[in-house]
Amino acid sequence: MMTGTIETTGNISAKKGGSVILQCHLSSTMAQVTQVNWEQHDHSLLAIRNAELGWHIYPAFKDRVAPGPGLGLTLQSLTMNDTGEYFCTYHTYPDGTYRGRIFLEVLESSVAEHSARFQIPIEGRDYKDDDDKHHHHHH
């Protein structure tokens, strides 16, 4: 029985040329996370975080995507084409697969300065990862 839930950063906005952190967190389950896949709106994979082997950044994004913090992903040098949906897929044992959605809107710099951000940081739980210990999670 799948009891877990995925919490994500939800709808977020960021400036063109800037960077943004995509973050998902699996809670309410004791299932073991074996792998997290990060996908873009067109279903192309950005990155894999395998629990045993670590990170793999797909070649098309190697210059613009940085692993972490935690199981999240940092997308850099944003372009207008980066606007759209992003998905985190958690492969777990024994539960199976959980999927979370984030919508990123990339704004022209001038617009971004006068626009209210979608994301409202709220104090969240700390969680542990093999690579990065105790990263604050915003949801």
């Epitope: 994979l45 894999i48 395998n50 045993e52 082997l53 670590g54 793999h56 797909y58 070649p59 190697k62």
Partner: antibody, heavy 121, light 106 residues
Framework: EVQLVESGGGLVKPGGSLRLSCAAS????????MSWVRQAPGKGLEWVGR??????????DYAAPVKGRFTISRDDSKNTLYLQMNSLKTEDTAVYYC????????????WGQGTLVTVSS | SYELTQPPSVSVSPGQTASITCSGD??????ACWYQQKPGQSPVLVIY???KRPSGIPERFSGSNSGNTATLTISGTQAMDEADYYC?????????FGGGTKLTVL
């Protein structure tokens, strides 16, 4: 220690079939993307195809010369990779290697010794 | 279909720097890998993901990849480095090898 051992090669007539196996050990096989690469006598390396891990869909990709004739599969419970070769041609004669795709820093293991497939009448 | 072009042969004196190039359309958007193969032996991965060295590969081997060209550089080349070298373009949908370069240490 990461180890890959290919087997199943041999002499087969044009139009025939053969199934190659690759026994993997020393790593968690189910995590790996695996490829088959071949090398004709005195020639260079040629990628045959690959199979992704189940957590990446377990999908397969093939090089144009073998598409529709060769099928790659895996049995994670047996730590074994397979290459089913049908409608073999003389130009398929080569040493066949199974390899680990270099996705991860800690899993870039050595190649096996390969297995020779000879297609001749 | 995607193609990679390597020079058939490169010569270098011991102790000097050898550079082997590999060219392909927008190769910089893919990962470049390099394999070393000595006569009668299986290939050995010497560079992966453009510039990373697997454990056990000497520091004199380095790689770069941008634009349409990937380069394998061997600094302080030794006689034992004489071999065939193959570049490989790797992405999530396909893999392609170059034709190979025979490195001769004079």
């Amino acid at each position: 220690e990461v180890q890959l051992v290919e087997s199943g090669g041999g002499l087969v007539k044009p139009g025939g079939s053969l199934r190659l196996s690759c026994a993997a050990s020393g790593f968690t096989f189910s995590n790996a993307w695996m490829s088959w690469v071949r090398q004709a006598p005195g020639k260079g390396l040629e990628w045959v195809g690959r199979i992704k891990s189940k957590t990446n869909g377990g999908t397969t990709d093939y090089a144009a010369p073998v598409k529709g004739r060769f099928t790659i599969s895996r049995d994670d419970s047996k730590n074994t990779l397979y290459l089913q070769m049908n409608s073999l041609k003389t130009e398929d004669t080569a040493v066949y290697y199974c390899t680990i795709d270099p996705l991860y820093d800690i899993l870039t293991g050595p190649w096996g010794q390969g297995t020779l497939v000879t297609v001749s009448s | 279909s995607y193609e990679l072009t390597q020079p058939p042969s490169v010569s270098v004196s011991p102790g000097q720097t050898a550079s082997i190039t590999c060219s392909g359309d927008k190769l910089g958007d893919k990962y470049a890998c390099w394999y070393q193969q000595k006569p009668g032996q299986s290939p050995v991965l010497v560079i992966y993901q453009d510039s990373k060295r697997p454990s056990g590969i000497p520091e004199r081997f380095s790689g770069s990849n941008s634009g349409n060209t990937a380069t394998l550089t061997i600094s302080g080349t030794q006689a034992m480095d004489e071999a065939d070298y193959y570049c490989q373009a790797w992405d999530s949908s396909t893999v392609v090898f170059g034709g190979g370069t025979k490195l001769t240490v004079l």
